[in-house]
Interface confidence: medium
Amino acid sequence: IWELKKDVYVVELDWYPDAPGEMVVLTCDTPEEDGITWTLDQSSEVLGSGKTLTIQVKEFGDAGQYTCHKGGEVLSHSLLLLHKKEDGIWSTDILKDQKEPKNKTFLRCEAKNYSGRFTCWWLTTISTDLTFSVKSSRGSSDPQGVTCGAATLSAERVRGDNKEYEYSVECQEDSACPAAEESLPIEVMVDAVHKLKYENYTSSFFIRDIIKPDPPKNLQLKPLKNSRQVEVSWEYPDTWSTPHSYFSLTFCVQVQGKSKREKKDRVFTDKTSATVICRKNASISVRAQDRYYSSSWSEWASVPCS
Amino acid sequence: RAVPGGSSPAWTQCQQLSQKLCTLAWSAHPLVGHMDLREEGDEETTNDVPHIQCGDGCDPQGLRDNSQFCLQRIHQGLIFYEKLLGSDIFTGEPSLLPDSPVGQLHASLLGLSQLLQPEGHHWETQQIPSLSPSQPWQRLLLRFKILRSLQAFVAVAARVFAHGAATLSP
């Protein structure tokens, strides 16, 4: 058993049929010694008396808010949550496996630049009685500070018969060094509580590996005289790290016909312009990627050829 | 050329070669990309690699003030990785012939380090990997980890030379 926060405790249980459970001793936070009784949740049934209460925690029915009273007055509370371990593996019932980039990916994180700011998100099908708490650091043995905000519900989607809820959190490294080569990964830890079930999820990454630039901005076409060719130009996204002579991007320019089956013409360039042939009803798209490190491509920025 | 006395390197040449290094480091990665990382473990070999850290002067402002600190750090890293790529870890099977990306990477690391420090000039305190032989089962995993680490190192080096070529070239 360990303390998650004041008056909230997590009991770690091996979860299998007829498991013996864990013996837990609760102590009433009071100077009083006599006349103390214990109840669980809203029930008025007295579970025991005395300053301490010893219970055998085996299942969710044994978890909940234990309250000690004296003469009708509440003295203190202890909320017990359960953390299940099945076949040596901690349960992951609350969050959905996003399966990208690999199986057992519950948290996904992205950064728009090297400033030390990043966003993580996760999915669940649970709509109520759900709380999240996020902590982060750079490195684990001698952790350096990363400050995370509160997790918020950022999207709701319908997936077949189920509703899916997306939560996200923004974090900022306290003393970021954008130009340095990271040697210690960022660690992100999410505590999830659904009713009386506790679970924790972690992710470990380098900012460089989660970089995904915003799409190029101000995408424009300039027809070239007496030619089917056009000059496409664009600019670095505002959110990208500066100076651009140091934090350089590379670009992919694509000409795509109306039909998905039509052959796509692609050009790769380090410049912020390119000359392409604009076909009728086609569109021109440009996306960006860090020039020197193969992290994710941005989403496409597009304009119609006409 | 970045000689220890403090004259400027051939920024444009260094930029071109460091960008090639980035490409090679990523094309070498698939050679070990199928790695099963379950046998993970923090081997000393990859813990000791020199990193370009915050105080090494490799940021745009540091380069403007005095690029020598940063260039020395890059040179140390290039020599370190060049030695690693010639070590037991990268020798032999799966075949790493000179025309493989790892072979070219090895040669390019040497080329860039020589551009930065021609024969006869010496920067002190070079960190050289002291390698105890890797166990055979560790070899593919170590290749994977070293190449991942090298990709990060050469990315920073390439940014330095690109910025130098754009803003510090005579």
């Epitope: - | 010639g86 070590s87 055979p136 070899r139």
Partner: antibody, heavy 115, light 107 residues
Amino acid sequence: EVQLQQSGPELVKPGASVKMSCKASGNTFTRYVMNWVKQKPGQGLEWIGYINPYNDGTNYNEKFKGKATLTSDKSSTTAYMELSSLTSEDSAVYYCVHNWDLDYWGQGTTLTVSS
Amino acid sequence: DIVMTQSPATLSVTPGDRVSLSCRASQSISHYLYWYQQKSHESPRLLIKYASQSISGIPSRFSGSGSGSDFTLSINSVEPEDVGMYYCQNGHSFPYTFGGGTKLEIK
């Protein structure tokens, strides 16, 4: 194809030393390790160690430390093994073997230690 | 050191037979196992690497299987020229160690 040409048979007296050679052709000498393996008459195989010709790094079987010394010469693409303080126990065929996978074997050098 | 044990010590077969040679490691060596053939008065030659990967130039009748600590070399239709000693080798950890060998002979 890799070919390994080993030096000829040796007859030496107990207590002496011997240095045998293995010339490699058809491969990039410095890109592969060279192993040495011992086989006593009518018996099995024992791995002695290897040398990495790129940086002269060596790795020995504990059993052969102090007995075998592995060296190489890049310019002639030749690996060498020196055996010291010879006894009759050292009488055997010694093979040089290319690569981690022991994929190409020399024809063997027969060493006879006898007074 | 990892001890490699081969069985049987000798195998007498008739041409055309399918035979299996066994090799056991004293601890798990994953798939880092090699098989060699040594004919009389010749150097050994590599038959199989990584427990089951075939080697170019080696007849397809030779195949390997197994992982962890139990391995098998199979010859699916023995030819008279297959006589000789067969050795397995631990390629997982140094020092490399070899099995004592299985002698394959024709009845």
